[in-house]
C-alpha cells in the first residue's frame, strides 16, 4: 500500500496504490484511487512507467486521450471511466507481458489539487495445481500438474499424517517449457502414497504460492486447490 | 450518429499504390477513445486486418503487410487514409474502414459499406 | 499470428432450430473474442465482443461463451434474417485475426 500526497497552491490529494502482480498473457489491474470529484471533465489521470517514455495512459475531459501513449502499451491498456468520478483510476491492462513488470505512477490532477503515488507490479506466471492419482506408477503414486509457472517455481511435498517429512527423495518433478517458450507446466510426481492421508503439492515462486489438497481413502478421493500472490497490497 | 465511407479508385493497375480514403461523418475521429482500422475481404474469402491509426497519427501495421502499407490521418477533414504500394492480384478486395469499440477492446463495432478494389492491367 | 478455426466451415439449418458455431484458438486469448454476422454484399456486424457480452441491438438469441482457447457462439432459435456467414475474431494480440467463418444455410 502506497499513499501519495500531493500539493496544488495550498490544495493537496490523496492518491493511494496497491503493489500487484500481473499473470502473463492474462489481464491485469493496476490499482490506483484518489479523493472523487464530481466535476469528471476536470480530472486528469496519467499513467506513467519508470524507464519509459511517453505514457501508458492517459484519460483527460472525461476520456481517453493515447497521444502520448508509448507504443508497448497500445491497444491495451483502459481505465475504468464509469468509476473514474468517484476516485477509481485503476489501469486494466491487456495481454500482460513479462517486460511490463516494473515501477509505475499513477498522477491525477483534479479542482481540488494534484496528487500522485509509485506502485511496484511485478509479472510471471502462476496457476491452480491439480493433483490426481497416477494410476500407471508401478506403486500408488500422486501426479501434481501446473500449466503455467514462470520464473521457475520451487515444489515441495507435504503430509498430513508425516509432517515435517523430507519428500524430496521419493518425488520426482520435472519443468516442460510451453509453446510461447516463457512460460512452463510444472509436473510434480510423488511415490510410495499411503491411503487415508491428506497430501500437499506446494508450488512457489517469488510472485505466487500454490497448493494443492489430495485425500485418498478406499472409498473417495478429495481434492482442493488454492492460489495467493505474494507481497502484494 | 456516426457513419464511415470508403472511397477511392475500384481499379488499380499491378506495381502501382492502392490508395483509400475513409471520410467520418456525424462524429469527430479525434474523440480520443478509438483507434481506425482498415480491413479487406478477398472475395469469397475471409477477413484480414490490415492496420489501425489512432487520431494523433500513431499506426500499428499488420507484419505481413507492413512494408508496403503506410496509414495517415487528417482530423480537418475527419479522415483516415491508407496506401498499399507495388500491389498485385493477390491485393484484389473489398477494403473496409472500422471503429475498434475502445482502446482496449478491439473488436469493430463500426463499419464502412466497404470498396471493391480490383488490382489489374 | 493468432490462428483462428472455426467449425463447422458451414452447417445446414432450419427456421427455430438451434445452431452453435465453434472457434479455436491457437493459443490463450482470455476472452477477447467477438463474433460477427456477414451477409452478400454488406460489411460485417459485430454480435459478441468480450466473448460472451451481446453488442447494444443485438437480438437475445444470439450468445457467446468459452475463455483462453475454445469459443462458441449460439442461435437459440433460428430466424430467416439470420442465415448469414459468421466469423470469429481475436482482440488479444497484434495483429488481430479472423476466423474463416461458417455459412449457416437454409436446410
Known amino acids: 500500500l502506497i499513499i501519495g500526497f500531493g500539493i496544488s497552491g495550498k490544495h493537496f490529494i490523496t492518491v493511494t496504490t496497491f503493489t500487484s502482480a500481473g499473470n502473463i498473457g492474462e489481464d491485469g489491474t493496476l490499482s490506483c484511487t484518489f479523493e472523487p470529484d464530481i466535476k469528471l471533465n476536470g480530472i486528469v489521470i496519467q499513467w506513467l512507467k519508470e524507464g519509459i517514455k511517453g505514457l501508458v495512459h492517459e484519460f483527460k475531459e472525461g476520456k481517453d486521450d493515447l497521444s502520448q501513449q508509448h507504443e508497448m502499451f497500445r491497444g491495451r491498456t483502459a481505465v475504468f471511466a464509469d468509476q473514474v468520478v468517484v476516485g477509481n483510476a485503476s489501469l486494466r491492462l491487456k495481454n500482460v507481458q513479462l517486460t511490463d513488470a516494473g515501477t509505475y505512477t499513477c498522477y491525477i490532477h483534479t479542482s481540488k489539487g494534484k496528487g500522485n503515488a509509485n506502485l511496484e507490479y511485478k509479472t510471471g506466471a502462476f496457476s491452480m495445481p491439480e493433483i490426481n492419482v497416477d494410476y500407471n506408477a508401478s506403486s500408488e503414486s500422486l501426479r501434481c500438474e501446473a500449466p503455467r509457472w514462470f520464473p521457475q517455481p520451487t515444489v515441495a511435498w507435504a503430509s498430513q499424517v508425516d509432517q515435517g517429512a523430507n519428500f524430496s527423495e521419493v518425488s520426482n518433478t520435472s519443468f516442460e517449457l510451453n509453446s510461447e517458450n516463457v512460460t512452463m507446466k510444472v509436473v510434480s510426481v510423488l511415490y510410495n502414497v499411503t491411503i487415508n492421508n491428506t497430501y500437499s503439492c506446494m508450488i512457489e515462486n517469488d510472485i505466487a504460492k500454490a497448493t494443492g489438497d489430495i485425500k485418498v481413502t478406499d472409498s473417495e478421493v478429495k481434492r482442493r486447490s488454492q492460489l495467493e500472490l505474494l507481497n502484494s497490497g | 450518429q456516426l457513419q464511415l465511407q470508403e472511397s477511392g479508385p475500384g481499379l488499380v493497375k499491378p506495381s502501382e499504390t492502392l490508395s483509400l480514403t475513409c471520410t467520418a461523418s456525424?462524429?469527430?475521429?479525434?474523440?480520443?477513445?478509438?483507434?481506425w482500422s482498415w480491413i479487406r475481404q478477398h472475395p469469397g474469402k475471409g477477413l484480414e486486418w490490415i492496420g489501425n491509426?489512432?487520431?494523433?497519427?500513431?499506426?500499428y501495421y499488420n507484419p505481413s503487410l507492413k512494408s508496403r502499407v503506410t496509414m495517415s490521418v487528417d482530423t480537418s477533414k475527419n479522415q483516415f487514409s491508407l496506401k498499399l504500394s507495388s500491389v498485385t492480384a493477390a491485393d484484389t478486395a473489398v477494403y473496409y474502414c472500422?471503429?475498434?469499440?475502445?482502446?482496449?477492446?478491439?473488436?469493430?463495432?463500426?463499419w464502412g459499406r466497404g470498396t471493391l478494389v480490383t488490382v489489374s492491367s | 499470428d493468432i490462428q483462428m478455426t472455426q467449425s463447422p466451415s458451414s452447417v445446414s439449418a432450419s427456421v427455430g432450430d438451434r445452431v452453435t458455431i465453434t472457434c479455436r484458438a491457437s493459443?490463450?486469448?482470455?476472452?477477447?473474442l467477438a463474433w460477427y454476422q456477414q451477409k452478400p454484399g454488406k460489411a460485417p456486424k459485430l454480435l459478441i465482443y468480450?466473448?460472451?457480452s451481446l453488442q447494444s441491438g443485438v437480438p437475445s438469441r444470439f450468445s457467446g461463451s468459452g475463455s483462453g482457447t475454445d469459443f462458441t457462439l449460439t442461435i437459440s432459435s433460428l430466424q430467416p434474417e439470420d442465415f448469414a456467414t459468421y466469423y470469429c475474431?481475436?482482440?488479444?494480440?497484434?495483429?488481430?485475426?479472423f476466423g474463416g467463418g461458417t455459412k449457416v444455410e437454409i436446410k
Open positions: 475474431q481475436q482482440a488479444h494480440t497484434f495483429p488481430y485475426t
Open positions: 456525424g462524429g469527430s475521429i479525434s474523440h480520443g477513445g478509438y483507434y
Open positions: 472500422a471503429r475498434e469499440s475502445s482502446t482496449i477492446s478491439a473488436d469493430f463495432d463500426l
Open positions: 468480450a466473448a460472451s
Open positions: 493459443q490463450g486469448i482470455s476472452r477477447w
Open positions: 491509426i489512432y487520431y494523433s497519427g500513431s499506426t
